[in-house]
Interface confidence: low
């Protein structure tokens, strides 16, 4: 996170930070007490899909305060319209080995309904990106959570005030922008798969996902978010399903 | 429509005003109050906007000049009171009052729902949690808030 | 196969603490079920009594909550429920069940033991 | 607490007919909504989860449809072993409920 603040311990209690063979990987946010959505570009380049690791509960990573709660990751399952190494469907859904146990410190977010999401929360102008990644572009990662405030654009808008580069990818259906083109504040490489939390009358909702950008707060382009809302429906039906067998499944879209 | 007016000074009246054009002046010598004697000219000098029964829906009628204003039932709004407000009660509008999930139906009034883990109050639009660790709630500020002194 | 068998005494008298055993075999209890109790008076419909997870965390039905223990033991395979201060509207089938939990709390109840009647009176 | 009211509370018919079992919410529960079946001296039985998902072996004859408040259990051709008790159950929210049952019995 780029020109953010720390998230007070417990205050960001739906935040997942994923680890493989013990290395930071991305962020996700747990939904309920056995599923966590995050971003399919995370696991691009996983080999030992049984050394995926979920921490709930984590702060400081550089210091054990009790709070914090391991689960194995059990499956990983991709829309089958995701392409690595693209942009687009930019959304994996985590069934982790054990449930979590609820606490002050872990809590979900909710996944809201799609019309609400799409008529109410997308109209919400402020939201919240969240994860211990680079505090600059190309630079350290943070020891504890970071969290901003970012505004949403309309997707003409975000291209109207975005500088045009050559082999940008588009801004789809399944996407949409937030942050700042003024190069002071952004997620970044690390926040990856982090939530973007929409606040609507006192409850707080997965809005989006933290995907992709052109570097981190650089001039002239904001952050790009997969949009929670176009998957609402694939994420509940998956979620509903018996388990199949395998670490990463691949499940049709839509 | 303004019928307190028949009430005031009747021969006063009949004499200076209706069968002669007065003056605001004369009007004023016959009321001798400022307001009443607004009241009086609103109507008299550009007809009285209420004549018509404007307002619908057992809204009462203020006339003021070349124009009126209509105070509505609780159900109703709208320049003549003539909508019902459940027919603006609509998802699209505000999220149709719900604090979480709006949903519209034909015919009837749109209904609010809420997530799992939360239940649908009593007013029909807000909702509580039936859980210890409801989703989208920040324990530590909850405890928080719930524990700030309370002004009285 | 997972199986669930309830066990306990039939008789209970009232005021006394009415306490039931579930053993669960084909599967581990500490894997990823909630595990419910629920019971039927004679002749009536279902009411839920509670649940508990494997990592112990519990919730109970607001009527019943003031007198109601649900407890698990990983190591039999168990988990059991205590209800206190019984009377004779206590008196019902009592069911454990098993919840194969995969959307949050959405409990749909895909295992029943068979059911221990219990009877309060003295 | 949500309240489901099931309807009829006995059902008469012949196999071979149709069967339509009624549950309504008294608010929303999207499609948390599930329908088990119970015979004399046996334990309930799931039949449909989530409104309308059949649950494991569950013949095809039984589905069920509906969200928000009503939903609809559906028998399409009776069948001798089909009467017994049909409840839904709320999976909403807490305190789980379930409705007081509709009895199918033979005509």
């Known amino acids: 996170i780029v020109g953010g603040k720390v998230c007070p311990k417990g205050e960001c209690p739906w935040q997942v930070l994923l680890l493989v063979n013990g290395a930071q990987l991305c962020g996700g946010t747990l939904i309920n007490t056995i599923w966590v959505v995050s971003a399919a570009h995370c696991f691009d380049k996983i080999k030992n899909w049984r050394n995926l690791i979920a921490v709930l509960g984590e702060h400081d990573l550089s210091e054990h305060d009790g709070d914090e709660q391991s689960r194995r990751v059990a499956q990983v399952i991709i829309p089958s319209t995701y392409v690595p190494g693209t942009t687009n469907h930019d959304i994996a859904l985590l069934r982790l080995h054990q449930p979590v146990v609820l606490t002050d410190h872990v809590v979900p977010l909710c996944l809201p309904e799609r019309t609400f999401s799409e008529r109410t929360l997308a109209f919400v102008r402020f939201s919240l990106v969240s994860g211990w990644g680079q505090l600059l572009d190309r630079g350290a990662t943070a020891l504890e959570l970071m969290v901003l405030n970012v505004p949403r654009l309309m997707t003409q808008d975000c291209l109207q005030q975005s500088r045009k580069v050559g082999d940008s990818p588009n801004i789809t259906e399944y996407m949409f922008c937030a942050g700042y083109s003024d190069g002071s504040k952004d997620s970044c490489k690390g926040d990856s798969g982090g939530p973007h939390a929409t606040h609507y009358r006192g409850t707080w909702y997965l809005t989006g996902i933290v995907s992709w950008g052109q570097g981190c707060a650089t001039v002239g382009h904001f952050g790009v978010y997969t949009r929670v809302s176009q998957y609402i429906e694939w994420l509940q039906k998956l979620m509903r399903s018996e388990p199949r067998p395998g670490v990463l499944l691949r499940a049709p879209f839509p | 429509a303004n019928a307190f007016l028949e009430e005031l000074r009747p021969g006063s009246l009949e004499r200076e005003c209706k069968e002669e054009q007065c003056s605001f002046e004369e009007a004023r010598e016959i009321f001798k109050d400022a307001e009443r004697t607004k009241l009086f000219w609103i109507s008299y000098s550009d007809g009285d906007q209420c004549a018509s029964s404007p307002c619908q829906n057992g809204g009462s009628c203020k006339d003021q000049l070349q124009s009126y204003i209509c105070f509505c039932l609780p159900a109703f709004e709208g320049r003549n009171c003539e909508t019902h407000k459940d027919d603006q009660l609509i998802c699209v509008n505000e999220n149709g009052g719900c604090e979480q999930y709006c949903s519209d139906h034909t015919g009837t009034k749109r209904s609010c729902r809420c997530h799992e883990g939360y239940s649908l109050l009593a007013d029909g639009v807000s909702c509580t949690p039936t859980v210890e660790y409801p989703c989208g709630k920040i324990p530590i500020l909850e405890k928080r808030n719930a524990s700030k002194p309370q002004g009285r | 196969q997972v199986q669930l068998q309830e066990s306990g005494p039939g008789l209970v008298k009232p005021s006394q603490t009415l306490s039931l055993t579930c053993t669960v075999s084909?599967?581990?209890?500490?894997?990823?079920?909630?595990w419910s109790w629920i019971r039927q008076p004679p002749g009536k419909g279902l009411e839920w009594i509670g649940y508990i997870y494997y990592s112990g965390s519990t919730n109970y039905n607001p009527s019943l909550k003031s007198r109601v223990t649900i407890s698990v033991d990983t190591s039999k395979n168990q988990f059991s429920l205590k209800l206190s201060s019984v009377t004779a509207a206590d008196t019902a089938v009592y069911y454990c069940?098993?919840?194969?939990?995969?959307?949050?709390?959405?409990?749909?109840?895909?295992?029943w033991g068979q059911g221990t009647s219990v009877t309060v009176s003295s | 607490e949500i309240v489901l009211t099931q309807s009829p509370a006995t059902l008469s018919l012949s196999p071979g007919e149709r069967a339509t079992l009624s549950c309504r919410a008294s608010?929303?529960?999207?499609?948390?909504l599930h329908w088990y079946q119970q015979k004399p001296g046996e334990a309930p039985r799931l039949l449909i989860k989530y409104a309308s998902q059949p649950a494991t072996g569950i013949p095809a004859r039984f589905s069920g449809s509906g969200s928000g408040t009503d939903f609809t259990l559906t028998i399409s051709s009776l069948e001798p072993e089909d009467f017994a008790v049909y409840y839904c159950?709320?999976?909403?929210?807490?305190?789980?409920?379930f409705g007081q049952g509709t009895k199918l019995e033979i005509k």
């Open positions: 608010q929303g529960l999207s499609d948390y």
């Open positions: 069940a098993r919840s194969v939990n995969y959307y949050g709390n959405s409990f749909a109840v895909g295992y």
């Open positions: 084909g599967y581990s209890i500490s894997s990823d079920s909630a």
């Open positions: 159950q709320n999976g909403h929210s807490f305190p789980l409920t």
